[in-house]
């Protein structure tokens, strides 16, 4: 799902307020939630009728580090049979999310928001047919 | 996919510099790839035999302020036919994602990372079957 | 509203290569993946290869692997598929598939016929 546009307001200061100083803000140490997890079902991605595997991305300058990026096996999608079938889709689903990325010079730390597209897994979906004249 | 604890490494400086005062750090404004987009197909949610509504929660201290929830239709898939297939099991696909909430006390204005668990769509799995003695 | 132009299609004799392409345009957008079916008098359409967009990952017929291959053009919204070794029973109507994911266009076939 998409993420709007900032349009630089969310992050301002009350306009009664002085400006914010040097184009940058005060982040909190600590993140709420923290302990908070998915609680998917094991193998989903294998038993899935649209059957993804995983690669996993590493940046340590980018909170969170590792990032998983979900790839479909097939086209199409897998049967009672455990035959392909192509008249069906295995279709990714993407979701917007953010990051963290971390700048540094020497003693001179500051981070920055990033989005960062994630597909999540895939799900089957039936096309509908157009035949082109 | 999981997003790992911080560890409070991750936004601390190098040993050898001197340590952030008051348990802050300096965020950038702006966000880094903000244009990018989800190119995912219309009507994807529809169009799944393991189909998903959306319910939008909203909250003006948070960015995005918009978040998207997906919630599986039905317990079992859509067949061929259209009818559904209890046999199999539709299955929410989750995803932790970081959301920024945001805290103010009159002009002072500061920020912290927040973890959100997001169903982001559903999948169509073949269950695994046990007969219980 | 999209549009396919298949092209190629032709008459060889068995071992020789022939290549068809198939472009896209209109509201081609969000492409899944691109590829071809063929079909031959009395029988139902057949999967013969295919190519997911995003990625460039390639799925073919056992009947064609190893002698057929699918290439994308991302820039022209164009496939192609190389046919190599052709064999008899290679001869039948060549379809061009476009998937938008929901949406699945099929093109107009172009005949390929493979004399012995």
């Known amino acids: 799902r998409k993420i709007p546009k900032v349009g630089h307001t969310f992050f301002q200061k009350p306009e009664s307020c002085p400006p914010v100083p040097g184009g940058s803000m005060k982040l909190d140490i600590g993140i709420i939630n923290e302990n908070q997890r998915v609680s998917m079902s094991r193998n989903i991605e294998s038993r899935s009728t649209s059957p993804w595997n995983y690669t996993v991305t590493w940046d340590p300058n980018r909170y969170p580090s590792e990032v998983v990026q979900a790839q479909c096996r097939n086209l199409g999608c897998i049967n009672a049979q455990g035959k392909e079938d192509i008249s069906m889709n295995s279709v990714p689903i993407q979701q917007e999310t953010l990051v963290v990325r971390r700048k540094h010079q020497g003693c001179s730390v500051s981070f920055q928001l990033e989005k960062v597209l994630v597909t999540v897994g895939c799900t089957c979906v039936t096309p509908v047919i157009h035949h082109v004249q | 996919r999981k997003i790992p604890k911080v560890g409070h490494t991750f936004f601390q400086k190098p040993e050898s510099c001197p340590p952030v005062p008051g348990g802050s750090m300096k965020l950038d404004i702006g966000i880094i790839n903000e244009n990018q987009r989800v190119s995912m197909s219309r009507n994807i949610e529809s169009r799944s035999t393991s189909p998903w509504n959306y319910t939008v929660t909203w909250d003006p201290n948070r960015y995005p302020s918009e978040v998207v929830q997906a919630q599986c239709r039905n317990l079992g898939c859509i067949n061929a036919q259209g009818k559904e297939d209890i046999s199999m099991n539709s299955v929410p696909i989750q995803q932790e994602t970081l959301v920024v909430r945001r805290k103010h006390q009159g002009c002072s204005v500061s920020f912290q990372l927040e973890k959100v668990l997001v169903t982001v769509g559903c999948t169509c799995v073949t269950p695994v079957i046990h007969h219980v003695q | 509203e999209v549009q396919l132009v298949e092209s190629g299609g032709g008459s060889v004799q068995a071992g020789d290569s022939l290549r068809l392409s198939c472009a896209a345009s209109g509201r081609a957008n969000s492409i899944n993946w691109f590829g071809w079916f063929r079909q031959t008098p009395g029988k139902e359409r057949e999967f013969v290869a295919g190519i997911r967009w995003s990625d460039a990952y390639t799925e073919y017929a056992n009947s064609v692997k190893g002698r057929f291959t699918i290439s994308r053009d991302n820039a022209k919204n164009t496939v192609d598929l190389q046919m190599d070794s052709l064999k008899p029973e290679d001869t039948a109507v060549y379809y061009c598939?476009?998937?938008?994911?929901?949406?699945?266009?099929w093109g107009q076939g172009t005949q390929v016929t493979v004399s012995s």
């Open positions: 598939v476009l998937d938008l994911s929901t949406v699945r266009y």
